[in-house]
């Protein structure tokens, strides 16, 4: 069922269908007894009340108040009283835009993100019944989409996607042809939430090693998901058999990042594997970040200071 | 312009074979080591499987060696990966981008599904 108007100031456009719904309606059906009555005061007119003869343009049902269709002279305040139960509604009728398929103040504005996920439903549930069709503009020119009762758009946002979105919905009441018309101003920005991709730990790292041994080196980042997390070595061991790159690992952290974890595992170490830089690149859009392992005989480490060595 | 476009990509029963190519442009494209990389099924990243160095050396995970061949056309600005001997853990889409270097924006990559 169609939520009860709760905002006290409404703006609506000359023209188009609009209703009032009170929110005490589950109980009204309760009480069907009870008198219900809706009012309006503009200026000098105090609570008037309506009913269908105030206008040929008004509807009352149980919950409702509809206007078919709503005109500028309707902007004023409405009440709906009902035993001890009030609510009341200031309403602001605006001009339409002559010169446009929508009225700038009665725009929505979302903000998306490039390559996030961004869709327009076009969707009357109140009206719903009514409607024999319904058409997605985009500044004012109609999209070709398949479904002509809820238009839709789905997709990853493209900086081309930026504009007016305005669902019409199209919909005859007493042999009369309206149309109601919701807007969506649709900026797209360029993703805010990347974080620049950082390795963890020291950028050098000597590891102690004994010849015929294994090693694991292993290597973390917290990246974005496009980035992108890889081992680099000397083109003289790019074929070493000895040489095998893991899986990689990635947990999403709580703030939507994520931690990535890729291991080099060395066998059989040999010579040719001492003090040649194994390095492990972090890459994304923004740039590259590099930590470098260095394989040292155990033999040697005497040589290497304290803060630089890695067991 | 979209830098980096993928294809050849398709269904392929086990045992199958497959190349996919990777047209780039908008950078010096003999100048960069280039790269193809796997995003598999439920996974929301992508993994390096081969590289190719800008004079050629060549470099490939264990799970794709001696299946997988990269090789690059410079005068093409393309880089072609030969998949033979496919398994259904290939099953992925993939995409090609540079390797060493800061990252292009990511093409639409190419879906390679095999079947048993």
């Known amino acids: 069922a169609e939520s009860c108007t709760s905002r006290p100031h409404i703006t609506v456009v000359e023209g188009e269908p609009f209703y009032l719904k009170h929110c005490s309606c589950s109980l009204a059906h309760e009480i069907e007894t009870t008198t219900k009555s809706w009012y309006k005061s503009s200026g000098s007119q105090e609570h008037v009340e309506l009913n269908p003869r105030s206008s040929s343009r008004i509807a009352l049902h149980d919950c409702v108040l509809e206007f078919w269709p709503v005109e500028l002279n309707d902007t004023g305040s409405y009440f709906f009283q009902m035993k001890n139960y009030t609510q009341k509604w200031k309403l602001n009728v605006i001009r339409r835009n002559k010169h446009s398929c929508f009225t700038e103040r009665q725009v929505t504005s979302k903000i998306v993100e490039v390559k996030k996920f961004f869709q327009i439903t076009c969707e009357n549930s109140y009206y719903q019944t009514l409607v024999n069709s319904t058409s997605l503009y985009k500044n004012c020119k109609k999209l070709l989409l398949e479904n002509n009762k809820n238009p839709t758009i789905k997709k990853n946002a493209e900086f081309e996607d930026q504009g007016y979105y305005s669902c019409v919905h199209f919909l005859h009441h007493n042999g009369k042809l309206f149309n109601i018309t919701k807007t969506f101003n649709i900026t797209i920005v360029e993703d805010r939430s990347n974080i620049v991709p950082v390795l963890l730990g020291p950028k050098l790292n000597h590891v102690a090693v004994e010849l015929g041994k294994n090693v694991r080196l292993n290597c973390s980042a917290l990246l974005n998901e496009e980035d992108v997390i890889y081992w680099m070595f000397g083109e003289e061991n790019g074929s070493d058999p000895n040489i095998h790159e893991e899986k990689e690992m990635r947990i999403m952290t709580p703030e939507g990042k994520w931690h990535a974890s890729k291991v080099l595992r060395i066998e059989n170490i040999g010579e040719s594997n001492l003090n040649v830089l194994y390095n492990c690149t972090v890459a994304s859009t923004g740039g590259t970040d590099t930590k470098s392992f260095i394989l040292v005989r155990k033999a040697d480490m005497a040589d290497i200071p304290g803060h630089v060595f890695t067991r | 312009d979209v830098p980096l476009q993928e294809s050849g990509g398709g269904l392929v029963q086990t045992g199958g074979s497959l190349r996919l190519s990777c047209a780039a442009s908008?950078?010096?494209?003999?100048?960069?080591?280039m790269g193809w990389y796997q995003q598999a099924p439920g996974k929301k990243y992508r993994e390096l499987v081969a590289?190719?160095?800008?004079?050629?050396?060549?470099r490939y995970i264990d799970s794709v060696k001696g299946r997988f061949t990269i090789s690059r056309d410079n005068a093409k600005n393309t880089v072609y990966l030969q998949m033979n001997s496919l398994k259904p853990e290939d099953t992925a889409v993939y995409y090609c981008n540079v390797y060493g270097a800061t990252l292009r924006s990511w093409g639409q990559g190419t879906q390679v599904t095999v079947s048993s």
């Open positions: 590289h190719i160095g800008s004079g050629g050396s060549t």
């Open positions: 908008g950078f010096t494209f003999n100048s960069y080591a």
